[in-house]
């Protein structure tokens, strides 16, 4: 029997600096997009190859972005955050929320070989 | 340093077949959203097909059926098959990108992307 899915939210603080395309993420959703049911919040799709979020190898896909140099990203057009990126300036700070699943309940255990494993 | 180079273009017959393509350098073509974009003389410029980073695409109703965006990774290069083309299919066509934007359709209704190429003349005559 598998145990419940359950997710730990956490929060942090990202500050990077702008390289020649930009922060090195791509993003998803917002109110006129949303990318995750009944939350218009914009969301990473993508961490770019040697990019500046990929050096500082915190910021993960699937994080959510919840402000932008101090400033909310609720309740914004796609393209509204997206403009927000593009004008954020030389040194960014980013506000993230981690969602790291984790598997509660009994979990059986695996023989070697288990086909399952 | 980001650079997007367009080719392919040329003069062709109504119900012709061209094949454009935009070659990147300086990046890593499949991390982005970018599209094809024309502009005829006199004109808006219109996003024709754009696609994003894992591959989801958008065509404007003018083309759907007819134009084919693909986009080789080991090339880096970006495609745009055009058949049956049509006189009002003429126009300058660009290539663009996106640094953030990973949703084909506002990349392609964006007046705001951040990598251009210098473009490649289609005329449909």
């Known amino acids: 029997m598998n145990g419940r899915v359950d997710y730990l939210v956490t929060e942090e603080e990202i500050n990077l600096t702008r390289g020649p395309s930009g922060l090195g993420f791509n993003i998803v959703g917002g109110t006129d997009q949303q990318y995750v049911s009944n939350d218009s919040g914009i969301y990473v799709s993508r961490i770019k190859e040697n990019g500046a979020a990929a050096l500082d190898g915190r910021l993960q896909e699937g994080d959510k972005i919840l402000s932008v140099n101090g400033q909310d990203l609720k309740n914004l057009l796609h393209q509204d955050a997206v403009d927000l990126f593009r004008n954020a300036g030389y040194a960014v700070s980013l506000r993230v929320q981690h969602r790291l699943q984790v598997q509660n309940g009994p979990i059986g255990h695996r023989g070697e070989g288990d086909p399952s494993g | 340093h980001v650079q997007l180079v367009e080719s392919g273009g040329g003069l062709v017959q109504p119900g012709g077949s061209l094949r454009l393509s935009c070659a990147a350098s300086?990046?890593?073509?499949?991390?982005?959203?970018i599209g094809w974009f024309r502009q005829a003389p006199g004109k808006e410029r219109e996003g024709v097909s754009c696609?994003?980073?894992?591959?989801?695409?958008y065509y404007a109703d003018s083309v759907k059926g007819r134009f084919t965006i693909s986009r080789d990774n080991v090339k880096n290069t970006l495609y745009l098959q055009m058949n049956s083309l049509k006189p009002e299919d003429t126009a300058l066509y660009y290539c663009a990108a996106s640094y953030y934007s990973d949703y084909e359709v506002a990349v392609c209704r964006s007046d705001a992307l951040d990598a251009w190429g210098q473009g490649t003349q289609v005329t449909v005559s």
């Open positions: 696609i994003s980073s894992h591959g989801s695409t």
């Open positions: 300086g990046f890593t073509l499949d991390d982005y959203a």
